[in-house]
Amino acid sequence: KSSNEATNITPKHNMKAFLDELKAENIKKFLYNFTQIPHLAGTEQNFQLAKQIQSQWKEFGLDSVELAHYDVLLSYPNKTHPNYISIINEDGNEIFNTSLFEPPPPGYENVSDIVPPFSAFSPQGMPEGDLVYVNYARTEDFFKLERDMKINCSGKIVIARYGKVFRGNKVKNAQLAGAKGVILYSDPADYFAPGVKSYPDGWNLPGGGVQRGNILNLNGAGDPLTPGYPANEYAYRRGIAEAVGLPSIPVHPIGYYDAQKLLEKMGGSAPPDSSWRGSLKVPYNVGPGFTGNFSTQKVKMHIHSTNEVTRIYNVIGTLRGAVEPDRYVILGGHRDSWVFGGIDPQSGAAVVHEIVRSFGTLKKEGWRPRRTILFASWDAEEFGLLGSTEWAEENSRLLQERGVAYINADSSIEGNYTLRVDCTPLMYSLVHNLTKELKSPDEGFEGKSLYESWTKKSPSPEFSGMPRISKLGSGNDFEVFFQRLGIASGRARYTKNWETNKFSGYPLYHSVYETYELVEKFYDPMFKYHLTVAQVRGGMVFELANSIVLPFDCRDYAVVLRKYADKIYSISMKHPQEMKTYSVSFDSLFSAVKNFTEIASKFSERLQDFDKSNPIVLRMMNDQLMFLERAFIDPLGLPDRPFYRHVIYAPSSHNKYAGESFPGIYDALFDIESKVDPSKAWGEVKRQIYVAAFTVQAAAETLSEVA
């Protein structure tokens, strides 16, 4: 059925009317408006922007727009006691100091309240010691250092390059290795694309540019002081010693000019192979410590940041559904930025603003969606997804009973090459069908569909003629909805042609140079990619809120479950002798997946044939679809990660940004050959297979005929 049959509306008010109302020029105007001053979480400027958005969403025609505030733990540098790193000589004199701020971009020299680069939630401290270069500080990098090179990081300050994995995982790995401090830096190999000039003449990172960011390991907890519950007026807060996910050692980020000064003196072991070398003119020696002439010099960190309970504000807008007002489709993205937020988040917030305006225009003409649409402008995403998580904790009972879908809307662009989508398998067919109806904005694809350009530029590795759609990981505001609550979720943005750097971000990510001009001059002068992303995000919301039968295909879940079962089995089968010794069998999981496949197929047949004019049966079938994602939630959560409760997907334990399939089994198998008690380790593998098999079977049964 087409969407315009969802409610008694004129054919004019269909998806086409909604999409036609979206204008690139408006997105451009909104982006400019949102990026003229910093909007750091917890500041007055960001509160004022929240009130502005509230006012404008009301003007656009939403039924209600409210602010939802919480008092959460944030982190700020000390204004009078700046953070920096020194090289000190044997007398303790500082012979080199890193910069205290980024040189401001042209036109922004007189802007106040630009927060200097810092690692949010770093503890205070002034450790000094020898430096060890740890590459990207990934799990495998520390394996290489400790197991192969026999280099001990205990009591050392480690220096790691940004990229590949979430910075919080780097810090966690360094802590576990015994380091007493971490220096993070942006290497040109990861943040300077060849043949492109540095900002302001191009989109590359200048030597004085620095990536800010939080270094928490929250594992979905939200506010570190109130895990599981909203940080409201009567909240009981943990003491700082019991707070969730805080790092225990000082951490600070620097740019590549300063990194050069630290790395050029490094001695000790040579890099193990070329994958440890970046693009600076330094040897990339691992250390520990400086080379001969400089061996008496040490590195000293000076970190004075403070953690403070601070008020944050979400903006929540409601467009009430005409037929099923108790079914919620949510479009949410964050508003807070590190500095100007030219890309992150305001390229996303500007798109949300235009989507709200378009929906509001239709509503003013007498249209309503079938289901309720909630729009959210989240606060404090940069400090650990705090605004979205606290709101979801406060509203969890409503969301778990009424939540149909969540569409995320952070940065609309991280490049201008092709579309990138991560979503639940339930949304694959929705995304395919929608992108077939949208025009491609790409050069050389005039008159062609977005689906065609996307498939050509980013083909699926498994299915010819289809585009790549990735697993959801984390690092953004969908986390609580998908990983904790089991609400079907998706995200879409335009990306670069740079698969190898998937998790490194664009060069100016989280720097002062992420400005309106960066976008307008270099990424999307016509705002055509922003418009396309608005059409994808908005089109998904429209279909989810308006189609009579929810646009979810459970058969696509069956396809991926077969793939994931085979993948995890393959990993386990690298240890055939142990599988035999400990009687490890995947038969229960294979059987559950087979049952899921058969039941999903039968459900899909019934979905084609049932009487859609019977509102009770319609609601019943839609509820089975809505609750399928929920059925993959284990109320007990994953081991040591109680807020990651989805059994099929979780953020990787080694990289929060990446999604892992069957994460319980995966983590039980990881590095199992090094476990001191193999019997216990393989017992946990067996337990995780049991949990996964049970969950898949239980989910399958939710799709069976109800009686």
Epitope: P461, K563, A565, D566, Y569, S570, V593
Partner: nanobody, 127 residues
């Protein structure tokens, strides 16, 4: 780490037969996809035949259908390729490939880390 062992290659006249075998020692049950590939000099590697050992389903390239037969001995974790009516164009190095999986009817695409390859065995068919 599991190693694949191939054997049975050699030289034969056109119209003759050979039987290749591939053993995956240590594989403790029968959930895997085993297949044969071949690479002739100056050409790309091409898939020849495969079997899902758990379900027993087999498949063949059109060029060998009716002449080659794939079979398995689960107790010995071994796959065989019986090659009859051999032709000079069958001359190639034959490789065994194994992926531990239950549902697949081909080697998993885009997941090379799941696939184990043998060293190859030479088959030469002279006219």
């Amino acid at each position: 780490q599991v190693q694949l062992q191939e054997s049975g290659g050699g030289s034969v006249q056109a119209g003759g037969s050979l039987r290749l075998s591939c053993t995956a020692p240590g594989y403790t049950d029968s959930n895997y996809y085993m297949s044969w590939f071949r690479q002739a000099p100056g050409k790309e590697r091409e898939w020849v035949a495969g079997v899902n050992t758990g379900r027993g389903s087999t498949s063949y390239a059109d060029t060998v259908k009716g002449r080659f037969t794939i079979s398995q001995d689960n107790a010995k974790n071994t796959m065989f390729l019986q090659m009859n009516s051999l032709k000079p164009e069958d001359t190639a190095i034959y490789y065994c490939a194994v992926a531990a999986c239950h549902f697949c009817d081909s080697l998993p695409k885009g997941q090379d880390e799941q696939i184990l390859w043998g060293q190859g065995t030479q088959v030469t068919v002279s006219s």
